[in-house]
């Protein structure tokens, strides 16, 4: 029962997370105009991964897509790639996890197959979440770097001229959506991996031994009850799970930087 709940909750959390990653990727507000120097601007600029927008006081909003591919910064391309990889892995993970759900019966699928599918989807969710977190963090780092560079230019590169005010950009809503969504997908993936341990049918480690008492013939099977709990020592399943954990650790080496302006 606890395993089913863990698996179901992992699936739901991952589903929410992936929906968030998709939303963040599509959002236009990855970076928004910093209003510190001009809080009463009548023209507000904001940018996404795919287009940049301008919203006027009049209510008129104009968005222009980045129609060039080669002219875009390599970092932006990298962030796009990370987010798309995250979405694709997450979508495949969701598809796999639907069939792996214990509450859903598909033909005569064995529990061991469901356990493997649960683990696979869990790992996919973990990598998906890490891709999203890495993508958002790379973009945030890029913003912080550009912010301080433009601040330095504002005060040192003017040469006495104060006619042009350089537009500085700060963190947009999409970054926070991305971080939270990536985190949820990661958590969902971990929950799926945990659920996998309890899903696999246990092999008993001891053969049934017959003990002959005087005048009575009773067959006592140690490990019989233990096997049904799902938490017994199972080297085969443990090996699979450890492999998954190792993959998780490897993927977690992605750079993650949360700099607030």
């Amino acid at each position: 029962m606890a395993v089913t709940a863990c698996q179901g909750l992992g699936f739901v959390v991952s589903l929410i997370g992936i929906a968030g990653i998709i939303a963040a990727t599509c959002m236009d507000q990855w970076s928004t105009q910093d209003l510190y120097n001009n809080p009463v601007t009548a023209v507000f600029n904001y940018q996404g991964l795919w287009r940049s927008c301008v919203r006027e006081s009049s209510g008129f909003t104009e968005c222009r897509g980045y129609f060039t591919l080669l002219g875009l910064p390599a970092m932006l391309q990298a962030v796009r790639a990370l987010m798309i990889v995250g979405i694709v892995l997450g979508a495949i993970g969701l598809l796999v996890s639907i069939f792996a759900l214990k509450c859903i019966r598909i033909g005569s699928m064995e529990d061991s197959a469901k356990a493997n599918m649960t683990l696979t989807s869990g790992i996919m969710f973990i990598v998906s979440g890490l891709c999203a977190i890495a993508g958002v963090s790379v973009f945030a780092n890029m913003l912080v770097t550009n912010f301080w560079m433009s601040t330095a230019n504002m005060y040192t590169g003017m040469g006495g001229m104060v006619q042009t005010v350089q537009t500085r950009y700060t963190f947009g809503a999409a970054l926070f959506v991305g971080w939270v969504a990536g985190g949820l997908t990661l958590i969902g993936g971990v929950m799926m991996c945990i659920a996998c341990r309890g899903l696999a049918p246990e092999e008993t480690n001891y053969k049934a031994v017959s003990y002959h008492a005087s005048g009575h013939s009773v067959a006592y099977k140690p490990g019989g009850f233990k096997a049904s709990t799902g938490f017994g020592s199972n080297t085969k399943n443990k090996k699979i799970y450890d492999g998954g954990a190792r993959t998780e650790d490897e993927v977690q080496s992605y750079p993650s930087k949360h700099d607030y302006v």
Partner: antibody
Framework: EVQLLESGGGLVQPGGSLRLSCAAS????????MSWVRQAPGKGLEWVAT????????YYADSVKGRFTISRDNSKNTLYLQMNSLRAEDTAVYYC???????????WGQGTLVTVSS | DIVMTQSPDSLAVSLGERATINCKSS????????????LSWYQQKPGQPPKLLIY???TRESGVPDRFSGSGSGTDFTLTISSLQAEDVAVYYC?????????FGQGTKLEIK
């Protein structure tokens, strides 16, 4: 046809109050940012205040800040300008305007004259 | 605040001739996000409210004759009337639409020579 009709102007003593209204018709009032612009007799144009579409943001000229309040009633298609602590220098024709692309003012009312004098 | 300065204060041009009015802003009105200049031009005839001629520094408002054109970028802008007509006699104002407070130039009075 777009129409903006100001009312509420008149003669008022210094320190007094007045409320200007602007009745809008011929367009979806709630979908536009609106402004008040004034023109002192024989002088140039001076922007007074702006209220954004939803009414959540308002902006004022430094000369009227703290004394004037811009508001709108989208259900009545009406823009207001509450003027308190009036001064002689507030004497002007007050125009109600609609903001469009480029934050430009494409339609202007005929104006209402406010005279502050003792 | 952005200060708008128009020149000349008054201008007399013969009918059919070109009229040029300049407007200078104390800060750039060019928005980097869309590469548009937030400046508009208005025409005001005696006893009438102002009329929008140009927005985004060079985009003509619908219904405005094509003899009116706007140009310039950053801090320097120009309104040009290619062939002056009698009905063009008015006061012309430029306006900063980029940041609050919105500010107008002092106006240029255009007359027929």
């Amino acid at each position: 046809e777009v129409q903006l009709l100001e009312s509420g102007g008149g003669l008022v003593q210094p320190g007094g109050s007045l409320r200007l209204s602007c009745a809008a018709s011929g367009f979806t009032f709630s979908s536009y940012t609106m402004s008040w612009v004034r023109q002192a007799p024989g002088k140039g144009l001076e922007w007074v205040a702006t209220i954004i579409i939803g009414g959540s943001y308002t902006y004022y000229a430094d000369s009227v800040k703290g004394r004037f309040t811009i508001s709108r009633d989208n259900s009545k298609n009406t823009l207001y300008l509450q003027m308190n602590s009036l001064r002689a220098e507030d004497t002007a024709v007050y125009y109600c305007t609609r903001l469009v692309k480029g934050n430009a003012m494409d339609y202007w009312g005929q104006g209402t004259l406010v005279t502050v004098s003792s | 605040d952005i200060v708008m300065t128009q020149s000349p204060d008054s201008l007399a041009v013969s009918l059919g001739e070109r009229a040029t009015i300049n407007c200078k802003s104390s800060q750039s009105l060019l928005n980097s996000g869309n590469q548009k200049n937030y400046l508009s031009w208005y025409q005001q005839k005696p006893g009438q409210p102002p009329k929008l001629l140009i927005y985004w520094a060079s985009t003509r408002e619908s219904g405005v004759p094509d003899r009116f054109s706007g140009s310039g970028s950053g801090t320097d802008f120009t309104l040009t009337i290619s062939s002056l007509q009698a009905e063009d006699v008015a006061v012309y104002y430029c306006q900063n639409d980029y940041s609050y407070p919105f500010t107008f130039g002092q106006g240029t009075k255009l007359e027929i020579k």
